[in-house]
């Protein structure tokens, strides 16, 4: 008799999830020699232990503590780049500007980027059919709790000037419900962080508006100021040129506004 299985609203665990996590761990520790002390088998065991045999709507940050401990990593606290709804450009930027880091440039972020996972209560199986959706099912699911945990720790580690890349093409340039708006903003430490600098990325070629005046950016400024952190904002009118100028800062066309 086939066992009854909970049907969730979200996509199931990414296929070959264990193999993918292991392979990513090996690759990451290979190209980051300072992390070669990490035992990827132990990392996978801790990752698995956070959600296997647990109800996928009952996951806590505590469940991920063994993994957090194994993945402890020091990144330069003044070189942190946060992002919201503009992941690809943020990653392209840190691939060029090698001394800056997004969460996905750290081991734990790299392991889980773009993956989905969940288990089932009281069985050691991984659920490849469906996983809880944050809105339709529950917020305390394995994926959401993981990103909340690592995002909080990442923001807490930041110091000096923290940069955030925001998508100027969206109706809410700053969204209070995003991971940045709901977790990272509130976990920047005022005693360590002097300024949050927002880079608003323009979508249209002819868009010359000052998106730093957008109401949602003003809302972000207000939240940040209330936390005793200074706020500044820059428009990035030409993201393609912006990246090009990060690659080749000596280029004569890079002195004008981008």
């Amino acid at each position: 008799v086939p066992r009854w299985r909970q049907q969730w609203s979200g996509p199931g665990t990414t296929k070959r999830f264990p193999e993918t996590v292991l392979a990513r761990c090996v690759k990451y520790t290979e190209i980051h020699p300072e992390m070669r002390h990490v035992d990827c088998q132990s990392v996978w065991d801790a990752f698995k232990g956070a959600f296997i045999s647990k109800h996928p709507c009952n996951i806590t940050e505590e469940d991920y503590q063994p993994l957090m401990k194994l993945g402890t990593q020091t990144v330069p606290c003044n070189k942190i780049l946060l992002w919201s709804r503009i992941k690809d450009l943020a990653h392209q930027f840190t691939q060029v500007q090698r001394d800056m880091f997004t969460l996905e440039d750290t081991l734990l972020g790299y392991l889980a980027d773009d993956l989905t996972w969940c288990g089932e209560f009281n069985t050691s199986k991984i659920n490849y059919q469906s996983c809880p959706d944050w809105r339709k099912d529950c917020s305390n699911n394995p994926v959401s709790v993981f990103w909340k945990t690592v995002s909080r720790r990442f923001a807490e580690a930041a110091c000096d000037v923290v940069h955030v890349m925001l998508n100027g093409s969206r109706s809410k340039i700053f969204d209070k419900n995003s991971t940045f708006g709901s977790v990272e903003v509130h976990n920047l430490q005022p005693e360590k962080v002097q300024t949050l600098e927002a880079w608003v990325i323009h979508g249209g070629r002819e868009d010359s508006r000052d998106l730093c005046q957008d109401p949602t950016i003003k809302e972000l400024e207000s939240i940040i100021s209330k936390r005793n952190i200074q706020f500044s904002c820059k428009n990035i009118y030409r993201p393609d040129k912006f990246l090009q100028c990060v690659k080749n800062p000596e280029d004569s066309s890079c002195t004008s506004e981008i």
């Epitope: 090996v26 520790t29 002390h37 691939q95």
Partner: antibody, heavy 116, light 108 residues
Framework: QVQLVQSGAEVKKPGSSVKVSCKAS????????FSWVRQAPGQGLEWMGG????????NYAQKFQGRITIVTDESTTTVYMELSSLRSEDTAVFYC?????????WGQGTLVTVSS | EIVLTQSPGTLSLSPGERATLSCRAS???????LAWYQQKPGQAPRLLIY???SRATGIPDRFSGSGSGTDFTLTISRLEPEDFAVYYC?????????FGQGTKVEIK
């Protein structure tokens, strides 16, 4: 501290095979990766191939494909490299290194002399 | 495969001087996956720099790396007696991983 200790020097006849061992200690073995790099007398460095035990994956340089075999013994944390159909141009110091592409720890090297 | 060409072949300098070693790739090295190694006579090489500019554990800060794409540089700000050796660059962005032919830094 990671240590890679290699087997001793060998003298081989052309056409024969050589198997060099490398005992690893001081770090996670199964999820580490290992490669072999050779250096002919007075020459530069040449990557031959690598292995990632936990993934069961090997990657060999085209030049050595068909002649090289890299395996590991997890029970003794030892990496082996076998090179067959030896010729005089294979005379070199063979280094066991940690890493499949970027090499942060090196063994002391094993001199293999191919001579009739 | 990516061919790495190092220049000069030999660099004759005195202790205390600055050494600048060049490594040029035949095609762009992805993600600046370029390393530098030092090798002294009768010894195995040791990793100095990875990711074009990150110093490996225990490497003194007189060693620095820079560059991206196809042009990379290793700089030794003030040569110490123990720095006279052969230096190799290596790319690990595209298999097969390849090394330059080496630059010998010798005492003038």
């Amino acid at each position: 501290q990671v240590q890679l200790v290699q087997s001793g020097a060998e003298v081989k006849k052309p056409g024969s095979s050589v198997k060099v061992s490398c005992k690893a200690s001081g770090g996670p073995f199964r999820s580490s990766s290992f490669s072999w790099v050779r250096q002919a007398p007075g020459q530069g460095l040449e990557w031959m191939g690598g292995i990632i035990p936990i993934l069961g994956k090997t990657n060999y340089a085209q030049k050595f494909q068909g002649r090289i075999t890299i395996v590991t013994d997890e029970s003794t944390t030892t990496v082996y490299m076998e090179l067959s159909s030896l010729r005089s141009e294979d005379t070199a110091v063979f280094y066991c290194v940690r890493g499949s592409s970027l090499f942060d720890y090196w063994g002391q090297g094993t001199l293999v002399t191919v001579s009739s | 495969e990516i061919v790495l060409t190092q220049s000069p072949g030999t660099l004759s300098l005195s202790p205390g001087e600055r050494a600048t070693l060049s490594c040029r790739a035949s095609q762009s090295v992805s993600s600046s996956y370029l390393a530098w190694y030092q090798q002294k006579p009768g010894q195995a090489p040791r990793l100095l720099i990875y990711g074009a500019s990150s110093r490996a554990t225990g490497i003194p800060d007189r060693f620095s790396g820079s560059g991206s794409g196809t042009d990379f540089t290793l700089t030794i700000s003030r040569l110490e007696p123990e720095d006279f050796a052969v230096y190799y660059c290596q790319q690990y962005g595209s298999s097969p991983w390849t090394f330059g032919q080496g630059t010998k830094v010798e005492i003038k």
